[in-house]
Interface confidence: low
C-alpha cells in the first residue's frame, strides 16, 4: 500500500526514500483472541527526530473514527498513548523505527472491518501519510475450548466443581457425573467476553465429573475425578 496524502516532501541531493506504507491485505483471528495489525512505512525525512503521532482508524481512510493514537516527544522512542478504544489497542511497533504495528485485545465479531494506519510528523518536517487501502481484520467465530476445570472445597466439608470455557458464540456448558441429577444442578453464569463458567455446587459421590462445552462450531469436554478417601481431591483432564 503505497498511496496516501503527501505534504511538503523535502528534497535531498542524495536519492531519498518516498513515502510508502506496507500493510497486509488481511489479518484473520478468532473472537476472544488478540490480533496484530502490521504496518511499516518509509519516509523522505531521513533523520527526522521531532515530535510524531501514530494513529489507527477504522472504517475508512482519512475520515474514519480513530481507535488508537499515541504521541512521541522529540527524540523519544516512547509513544505515549492518548487514545485506545476501550483499552483494547496497544502499539507493538516503534514509530521511530518506522513500525506502527498494533495489537488488538479481546476481539469481538464486531471488530471485523478495515483499519488504517497513519503517521504525522509535527515538527519542522511537517508531514503526514496514511494507508489508503488499509488492512482488513476478519474476526471469526471460535469453537469451544475448556480453559479451566477444577474441584474446590465447598461449605460443610463438601466439594464443588468449576468449569470455564470460551468460544464464540459463547458455548453452553453442561456437567455430568456419577450422581443422578448432577447436570441439572449445574449453575451457569456469563463470564467476561467469550468465557462462560458453570458450577456444580455439591459433589455428593466420588468419581468422574465431566464438563461439556458446545456451540454451533463444535464441542469440547474435560473431566475431574473426586476421591475423597485420598484426602485432597485429585484432578485430571
Amino acid at each position: 500500500d503505497a498511496s496516501g496524502d503527501l505534504l511538503n516532501t523535502e528534497a535531498h541531493s542524495a536519492p531519498a526514500q518516498r513515502w510508502s506504507m506496507q500493510v497486509p491485505a488481511e489479518v484473520n483471528a478468532e473472537a476472544g483472541d488478540a490480533a496484530v495489525l502490521p504496518c511499516t512505512f518509509t519516509h523522505p525525512h531521513r533523520h527526522y527526530d521531532g515530535p510524531l503521532t501514530a494513529i489507527w482508524r477504522s472504517g475508512e481512510p482519512y475520515a474514519g473514527p480513530q481507535v488508537f493514537r499515541c504521541t512521541a516527544a522529540p527524540g523519544s522512542e516512547l509513544c505515549q498513548t492518548a487514545l485506545s478504544l476501550h483499552g483494547r489497542f496497544r502499539l507493538l511497533g516503534n514509530p521511530r523505527r518506522n513500525d506502527l504495528s498494533l495489537r488488538v485485545e479481546r476481539l469481538a465479531l464486531a471488530d471485523s472491518g478495515r483499519y488504517f494506519c497513519r503517521v504525522e510528523f509535527t515538527g519542522d518536517a511537517h508531514d503526514r501519510y496514511e494507508s489508503r487501502h488499509g488492512v482488513r481484520l476478519r474476526v471469526t467465530a471460535a469453537a469451544p475450548r475448556i480453559v479451566n476445570i477444577s474441584v474446590l472445597p465447598g461449605p460443610a466439608h463438601a466439594f464443588r466443581a468449576l468449569c470455564t470455557a470460551e468460544g464464540e458464540p459463547p458455548p453452553a456448558l453442561a456437567w455430568s457425573g456419577p450422581a443422578p441429577g448432577n447436570s441439572s444442578a449445574a449453575l451457569q453464569g456469563q463470564g467476561h467476553g467469550y468465557q462462560v463458567t458453570a458450577e456444580l455446587p455439591a459433589l455428593t459421590r466420588d468419581g468422574r465429573y465431566t464438563c461439556t462445552a458446545a456451540n454451533s462450531l463444535g464441542r469440547a469436554e474435560a473431566s475431574v475425578y473426586l476421591f475423597r478417601f485420598h484426602g485432597a481431591p485429585g484432578t485430571s483432564t
Epitope: 477504522s58 472504517g59 475520515a63 473514527p65 480513530q66 478504544l85 469481538a108 464486531a110 458464540p169
Partner: antibody, heavy 122, light 107 residues
C-alpha cells in the same frame, strides 16, 4: 458551543417525502460517524440510520431500508435524512446523534439534537 | 437482531434511595452497552458507555456494570433531577437496538 440542530420536520401525507437536516457546530464534524434515532409519541427510542465520518459507509434499520437515505456534507457540517414513501408508522420525533468517537460499528451517542417532529397523516 | 430487555419497566423511589435498573441482551454483546437518561420533551443524554465508563460531566452517583448479556445501571443516592426514563442500548452490531425504557418516578 458543541451542538446539533435539526430542521425539516412537519406534516406530510402517506406516500410523501421529507428531507431532514442536522447542522453541527463546535466539533470536527468529518471525524465522527453520525446517526438518526427516532421516537414515536409515547414510545421508546429506535435507531434509524448511521453514516461514517467520510460518508463512505451507510447503514439502515430494516424498517426504513429502501425508503430513507442518509447523507452528509462535511463542507457544510450538515447531516441529512431523505425520507420517501412515508408511512403512518414513521411518525416520530427524529433526533440526529453524534458517535462518541470510537469505531463506527461500536458506538454510543454522546451528543443529540433537540429533535424535529415528523407527522405522517392524511 | 439483538433484543434488549429492561427491568423493571417502572420503579418508584425516594430521594436518597439506591436504585438499580437491569438490562439483558438476547445474545452476548461483550461490553458494548450504553445507558441514557431522557426527560419529557428532551433529547436523551448519555450516562454510561462501554458498560461501565462514565460519560464526562455525569455525576459519579451513576455507575454501570456487567458484560456479556446482563448489565446494571445503579444510582447510588437518588437526587430530584434523576427522575426520568432510562434506556439501555447495544452497539455490538447493527442494527443498534434500545431497551424499552425504565421510568423512574417519585414515590
Amino acid at each position: 458551543e458543541v451542538q446539533l440542530l435539526e430542521s425539516g420536520g412537519g406534516l406530510v401525507q402517506p406516500g410523501g417525502s421529507l428531507r431532514l437536516s442536522c447542522a453541527a457546530s463546535g466539533f470536527t464534524f468529518s471525524s465522527y460517524a453520525m446517526s438518526w434515532v427516532r421516537q414515536a409519541p409515547g414510545k421508546g427510542l429506535e435507531w434509524v440510520s448511521t453514516i461514517s465520518g467520510g460518508g463512505g459507509s451507510t447503514y439502515y434499520a430494516d424498517s426504513v431500508k429502501g425508503r430513507f437515505t442518509i447523507s452528509r456534507d462535511n463542507s457544510k457540517n450538515t447531516l441529512y435524512l431523505q425520507m420517501n414513501s412515508l408511512r403512518a408508522e414513521d411518525t416520530a420525533v427524529y433526533y440526529c446523534a453524534k458517535a462518541i468517537g470510537s469505531s463506527w460499528y461500536s458506538d454510543a451517542f454522546d451528543l443529540w439534537g433537540q429533535g424535529t417532529m415528523v407527522t405522517v397523516s392524511s | 437482531d439483538i433484543q434488549m430487555t429492561q427491568s423493571p419497566s417502572s420503579v418508584s423511589a425516594s430521594v436518597g434511595d439506591r436504585v438499580t435498573i437491569t438490562c439483558r441482551a438476547s445474545q452476548d454483546i461483550s461490553s458494548w452497552l450504553a445507558w441514557y437518561q431522557q426527560k419529557p420533551g428532551k433529547a436523551p443524554k448519555l450516562l454510561i458507555y462501554v458498560a461501565s465508563s462514565l460519560q464526562s460531566g455525569v455525576p459519579s452517583r451513576f455507575s454501570g456494570s456487567g458484560s456479556g448479556t446482563d448489565f446494571t445501571l445503579t444510582i447510588s443516592s437518588l437526587q430530584p433531577e434523576d427522575f426520568a426514563t432510562y434506556y439501555c442500548q447495544q452497539s455490538y452490531s447493527i442494527p443498534y437496538t434500545f431497551g424499552q425504557g425504565t421510568k423512574l418516578e417519585i414515590k
